[in-house]
């Protein structure tokens, strides 16, 4: 069978080989398409509702005025010339529709290095067959599930036209120290060969790298955190970051209901004040960062306090990025 591709909505003429150029002709067309159940036979006499879909021309060719998805299938012509020689023509018809240029919607203006970011969603509307969407970074294809790249795809079919809408959402994790202005584009590749890809205009988000917060220092006075009953303990949270972050305080892992402050004073220490204290610095462009934990304890008169203080672990580190 000879492969024929025809654009949806366009006319199509299929030649019936070996047929006399004009009537009288002995020929018949057989169609097995989405419009037929098994084989439909069309003769030069024509007539009836099929004429609006396909009709035999005076020269024996089959004419389809506007090809649709339903017309995909096999078209066969059997013709006998004046000498009684039989010729068969066999066509496999496939239809296509090129969509509009793909578009990127919900495009991100800024990405944060080191964390996953949604770059945007590429949308292609009105294709047949469905085709595929692919993403490019600085002109080179991006491979999903490699180097922090992930793609979520969705294909929908229009209930009336039968045409496809494709969506592809790109997520990337930009490398620290990488290109601060990467250029992403998306392209639609048709499902039928010999048609070139359609590419979107480029999207150029800005990538920024949050400054790694320098370690939050927790200073306790008196050193070691051991104090006699009724004494005073001063905890100071030191953060080198600028502008100064908000400082909140934790006791035994629970936030203390106090306004933000870099200094926590515990006057007239009693048993209820004993515990493990830490501070949490929250920078507006970072997540919270917790200091080391210090243990505050009461020493009875005559007891020796711990020499270097009882210090907990290193805190939770960075809880979240921007």
């Amino acid at each position: 069978a000879q492969n024929i591709t025809a654009r949806i909505g366009e006319p199509l003429v299929l030649k019936c080989k070996g047929a006399p150029k004009k009537p009288p002709q002995r020929l018949e067309w057989k169609l097995n398409t989405g419009r037929t159940e098994a084989w439909k036979v069309l003769s030069p006499q024509g007539g009836g509702p099929w004429d609006s879909v396909a009709r035999v021309l005076p020269n024996g060719s089959l004419f389809l005025p506007a090809v649709g998805i339903q017309d995909e299938g096999i078209f066969r012509c059997q013709a006998m010339n004046r000498n009684g020689k039989e010729t068969k023509s066999n066509y496999r018809v496939r239809v296509y529709q090129i969509p509009g240029k793909p578009e990127i919607v919900d495009s991100a203006s800024e990405l944060t290095a080191g964390v996953p970011n949604k770059v945007g969603t590429c949308v292609s509307e009105g294709s047949y067959p469905a085709g595929t969407l692919s993403w490019h970074l600085d002109g080179k294809p991006l491979v999903p599930n490699e180097k922090g790249v992930s793609v979520k795809e969705q294909t929908r079919r229009h209930p009336e036209t039968g045409l496809f809408t494709l969506q592809s959402e790109l997520m990337v994790t930009p490398a620290r120290g990488g290109d601060p202005r990467p250029t992403f584009s998306c392209s639609f590749s048709p499902g039928l060969p010999r048609h070139r890809a359609l590419r979107t205009a480029p999207i150029q988000p800005r990538v920024w790298e949050p400054v790694p917060l320098e370690e939050v220092q927790l200073v306790v006075e008196p050193e070691g955190g051991a104090v006699a009953p009724g004494g005073t303990v001063t905890l100071t949270c030191e953060v080198p970051a600028q502008p100064s972050p908000q400082i909140h305080w934790m006791k035994d892992g629970v936030p203390l209901p106090l306004p933000p402050s870099p200094v926590l004073i515990l006057p007239e220490i009693g048993p209820q004040d004993q515990g493990t204290y830490s501070c949490v610095a929250t920078h507006s462009s970072h997540g919270p960062q917790e200091s080391r934990a210090v243990s505050i304890s009461i020493i009875e008169p005559g007891e020796e306090g711990p020499t270097a203080g009882s210090v907990g672990g290193s805190g939770l580190g960075t809880l979240a990025l921007a």
Partner: antibody, heavy 121, light 108 residues
Framework: QVQLQQPGAELVKPGASVRLSCKAS????????MHWVKQRPGQGLEWIGE????????NYNEKFKSKATLTVDKSSSTAYMQLSSLTSEDSAVYYC??????????????WGQGTSVTVSS | QIVLTQSPAIMSASPGEKVTISCSAS?????MYWYQQKPGSSPKPWIY???NLASGVPARFSGSGSGTSYSLTISSMEAEDAATYYC???????????FGGGTKLEIK
């Protein structure tokens, strides 16, 4: 420290072209994009376009695509903007500004003093 | 193209007064940037990524907002704050920076 030096003023005739310069110092010129911004007397700021000095890649405001051409000379760490077919509408102060990407995601972190362009016959 | 509309265009405030300048975007934007410009000077970066103060900006300034509505606030106006403030955003598709029309803030 970072400095962007621009000539103070240019007087040009209608229909002519002018090339404005912006000499960068105090940082690695090729590591930061450079913007150009227009400000007409008593008016607001208008972004013209930007250029990546390392590879010459440009982005333009559609409005200025046929008016402005951005180039760089890496050897002298200088960015240029050529303005063509000048009219009185082009009389303005033109600023170059360094892109502030990096640890502080400021769009334009250092600005030149601006060049005042007067179009007059 | 996204349009940024600042309001008011001109305003005056007394020392110690709280001041809020608004910037409205014609469609949703991720972040807003603010610049301060005084007569005869170049603009200076003032607030970046909606709420972060640029280096040297007094703590009485703050920025907030999301979507289409953003603002710059001065908790207690001082004489040195008299200037024109511009909001600005970046759109990545196609790459384009847009400035608001500016708000001229005067001291009473």
């Amino acid at each position: 420290q970072v400095q962007l030096q621009q000539p103070g003023a240019e007087l040009v005739k209608p229909g002519a072209s002018v090339r404005l310069s912006c000499k960068a110092s105090g940082y690695t010129f090729t590591s930061y994009w450079m913007h150009w911004v227009k400000q007409r007397p008593g008016q607001g700021l208008e972004w013209i376009g930007e250029i990546n000095p390392s590879n010459g890649r440009t982005n333009y405001n559609e409005k200025f695509k046929s008016k402005a051409t951005l180039t760089v000379d890496k050897s002298s760490s200088t960015a240029y903007m050529q303005l063509s077919s000048l009219t009185s509408e082009d009389s303005a102060v033109y600023y170059c500004a360094r892109d502030g990407l990096g640890y502080r995601p400021i769009a334009m972190d250092y600005w030149g003093q601006g060049t005042s362009v007067t179009v007059s016959s | 193209q996204i349009v940024l509309t600042q309001s008011p265009a001109i305003m005056s405030a007394s020392p110690g007064e709280k001041v809020t300048i608004s910037c409205s975007a014609s469609s949703s934007v991720s972040y807003m940037y603010w610049y301060q410009q005084k007569p005869g000077s170049s603009p200076k970066p003032w607030i970046y990524r909606t709420s972060n103060l640029a280096s040297g900006v007094p703590a009485r300034f703050s920025g907030s907002g999301s979507g289409t509505s953003y603002s710059l606030t001065i908790s207690s106006m001082e004489a040195e704050d008299a200037a024109t403030y511009y909001c600005q955003q970046y759109h990545s598709y196609p790459p384009m920076y847009t400035f608001g029309g500016g708000t001229k803030l005067e001291i009473k």
